[in-house]
């Protein structure tokens, strides 16, 4: 892969350890926490990034109405189990043997249970709604300029194929970005919408995962776009299974 050959770093993931010990002395990078080799020509999976984060020192109306089945990540950070490809394992458990099922972006989609809980398949999150509220500006952004800038960002910075950015909605001060990627649409080598959304989320929070790049400087026609609130909704190909107790 294309880890930077000169000083052997990973452009797309600063939470790595790199050394020129690959075949032919090529630079090879491994994710912190898991030790798994990562492909530095593309985004690292969210599962490996979360694992690396948990291993790091602690101090380091035109708008869419989310579906009734949409999930929000209310559980916060945890140390996930990742499969050999770096994806989330369908079942996650903590140190006290409490287990739950997650979707492909690692968000809990069932009630918590014990070690007998079965999670037979990793259910894909096929629709992500990123809901942003921007800080006050002199006037509203031009919708088509905003649309073009956000599409460019996902294409160029996160390497997400343009067809997966389904829509950009704007009703000042709320911006919504819809990412859609069905199982049958995702081709080998495509960036996963869950990974792109996670990189975007970290960028917005000023915690860029890219190596040595400045933070995200989002501008629409020269006007800074500063985000003061972010909410992300996840919609799975198969609806989540929560008890009625949680829903009331």
């Amino acid at each position: 892969h294309t880890a930077a050959q000169d000083n052997c770093t990973c452009p797309t993931n600063k939470m790595t350890v790199c050394s020129p010990d690959g075949p032919g002395g090529r630079c090879q990078c491994r994710a912190l926490g898991s030790g798994m080799a990562v492909d530095c020509s593309t985004l690292t999976s969210k599962c490996l990034l979360l694992k690396a984060r948990m291993s790091a020192p602690k101090n380091a109306r035109t708008l869419v109405r989310p579906s009734e089945h949409a999930l929000v990540d209310n559980d916060g950070l945890y140390d996930p189990d990742c499969d050999p490809e770096g994806r989330f394992k369908a079942r996650q458990c903590n140190q006290t043997s409490v287990c739950w099922c997650v979707n492909s972006v690692g968000v809990r989609r069932t009630d918590k249970g014990d070690l007998s809980l079965r999670c037979d398949e990793l259910v894909r999150t096929h629709h992500i709604l990123i809901d942003l509220r921007h800080r006050p500006t002199a006037g509203a952004f031009n919708h088509s300029d905003l649309d073009a800038e956000l599409r460019r960002l996902f294409r160029e910075r996160y390497r997400l194929h343009p067809k997966f950015v389904a829509a950009v909605h704007y009703e000042q001060p709320t911006i919504q970005i819809e990412l859609r990627q069905n199982t049958s649409q995702k081709a080998a080598g495509d960036v996963d919408i869950g990974d792109a959304a996670y990189y975007f989320e970290r960028d917005i929070k000023g915690e860029s995962l890219f190596q040595g790049r400045g933070g995200l400087d989002l501008r629409v026609r020269g006007e800074p776009l500063q985000v003061e609130r972010t909410l992300i909704y996840y919609l799975d190909e198969i609806p989540p299974k929560f008890s009625m107790k949680r829903l009331t």
């Epitope: 050999p84 049958s184 081709a187 080998a188």
Partner: antibody
Framework: QSLEESGGGLVQPGASLTLTCTVS????????MTWVRQAPGEGLEYIGF??????IYYANWAKGRFTISKTSSTTVTLQMTSLTVADTATYFC??????????????WGPGTLVTVSS | YDMTQTPASVSAAVGGTVTINCQAS??????LAWYQQKPGQPPKPLIY???TLASGVPSRFKGSGTGTDYTLTISDLECADAATYYC????????????FGGGTEVVVK
Amino acid sequence: QSLEESGGGLVQPGASLTLTCTVSGFDFSSNAMTWVRQAPGEGLEYIGFIGIRGNIYYANWAKGRFTISKTSSTTVTLQMTSLTVADTATYFCARGGLWTGNSYFDLWGPGTLVTVSS
Amino acid sequence: YDMTQTPASVSAAVGGTVTINCQASESISRYLAWYQQKPGQPPKPLIYRASTLASGVPSRFKGSGTGTDYTLTISDLECADAATYYCQQGYGYSTVGNAFGGGTEVVVK
């Protein structure tokens, strides 16, 4: 819609060989392509595939000696080096890849036989 | 990701039923396909995503399973069903030993 493999034949141990898969009747640019082989009387053995963005993935055992590439708008090749008698097999190309689309191979070529012998 | 297929061979009478099992070394989340192969021919897809019939395949062929364990059931056996059957995982892509199971020969008496 069809696939056809070519380039097989008799080669000596240690030699190199390139097989070609020619596609017709469908859009090559929107499909992953896979190589599979089958030794005489044995089962199917996955070699690797090339995705539509050009990403290439190999079976663990095939990394290093086998190279898959797209050489034109209608052909994908499999380069094999340092051939041994154990590489004697019928080589198939198939449409589809792993962890892509429905993740199976829905169209196969008839195969081309490679015999490695001194 | 490696696949273990059992049995290696099975025989049954015309009109009978056979069951073939496939076990993955890790969960493959229903990314499993089944193929039929006859001598001198390439494999023919029967089932994908564990239970979806490929085009033109009769409903006598049924796939099931989740997680690591999958089954192909062929009912109302016909002489034309005599062949070797293979499972194939489609979930792992860069850490794969062999995507295919070892095969099961079905003999129809």
